[in-house]
């Protein structure tokens, strides 16, 4: 059965300066390959977080993604700014050179409210 990427919230609202959690769960870790979060779609989409590296200052994983059975790939964005508004996608890749996108969540739109 094909892996499914579940983003339960269609949208979230957050006040500027606050934090927000974007939820994402997978139904399987197979096939092996990385999970990444993007804002937007297509060629211009922006990488927001990758579970393969740890160089994303304002974004952290919510659960312990180093658990070998972990299926929760939710992220927390801190100190949200108006520039963070947009639709965020949790994307599962299959390993390869390069990795191949095989499944994306439905997206969660982030609205940033003035404080």
């Amino acid at each position: 059965t094909e892996v499914k990427v579940i983003q339960p919230e269609k949208s979230v609202s957050v006040a500027a300066g606050d934090s927000t959690v974007l939820n994402c769960t997978l139904t399987s870790l197979l096939p092996v390959g990385p999970i990444r979060w993007y804002r937007g779609v297509g060629q211009s989409r922006q990488l927001i977080y990758s579970f393969t590296t740890e160089h994303f200052p304002r974004v952290t994983n919510v659960s312990d993604a180093t658990k070998r059975s972990n299926l929760d790939f939710s992220i927390r964005i801190s100190n949200v700014t108006p520039e963070d508004a947009g639709t965020y996608y949790c994307v599962k890749f299959q390993r390869g050179s390069p990795d191949t996108e095989i499944q994306s969540g439905g997206g969660t739109e982030v609205y940033v409210l003035a404080k």
Epitope: T52, T53, A65, R68
Partner: antibody
Framework: DVQLVESGGGVVRPGESLRLSCAAS????????MSWVRQAPGKGLEWLAG????????YYIDSVKGRFTISRDNSKNSLYLQMNSLTAEDTAVYYC???????????WGLGTLVTVSS | ALTQPASVSANPGETVKITCSGG??????YGWYQQKSPGSAPVTVI????KRPSDIPSRFSGSASGSAATLTITGVRVEDEAVYYC???????????FGAGTTLTVL
Amino acid sequence: DVQLVESGGGVVRPGESLRLSCAASGFTFSSYAMSWVRQAPGKGLEWLAGISAGGSDAYYIDSVKGRFTISRDNSKNSLYLQMNSLTAEDTAVYYCARETWNHLFDYWGLGTLVTVSS
Amino acid sequence: ALTQPASVSANPGETVKITCSGGDWYSTYYGWYQQKSPGSAPVTVIHSDDKRPSDIPSRFSGSASGSAATLTITGVRVEDEAVYYCAGYDGRTYINTFGAGTTLTVL
């Protein structure tokens, strides 16, 4: 620089216990899963156990399940391996290793020798 | 179990390929580890199929396809003499496995 330093090895009798430690420095220890790997004299590498970054999940090879326990103390940047009911077959150099995101290894300690002999 | 040749040999400057088979493309990631003498600390030369740590020379490369992984050393040097172990992480069983090791001799 990433550094892993094992300690606690030595000579013990069959049936006895030993606790190995691995002191980590040069990286955010609490962000990484860790593993123990051993090498018996004249043999190859053998993975024994791995533990998640937060310490709540542990995994073992069948041959040590129930006898060995992997644990960690993130406040002390330390990894441990409690070994009980040791036998001569457990004689080996024991290495701690830092795991990559997909549970392979990127950094290794120098190892500590455990000898089980009567 | 992961299977690799017991030994390979090459002249300096030649290209060496060491294969590791027995994994499953769907569930297994591979790594390669160099050990220059028994009991000395292994050194990671490749992880995640093809990722080379920054301090490893570019002559080392890795690839994976189907049920096998390959370590390639392009322009092998005398200092590359060592035992090379492949390892796999199986995302189905959550277990790591090592191959028996391949002794590389540079003639």
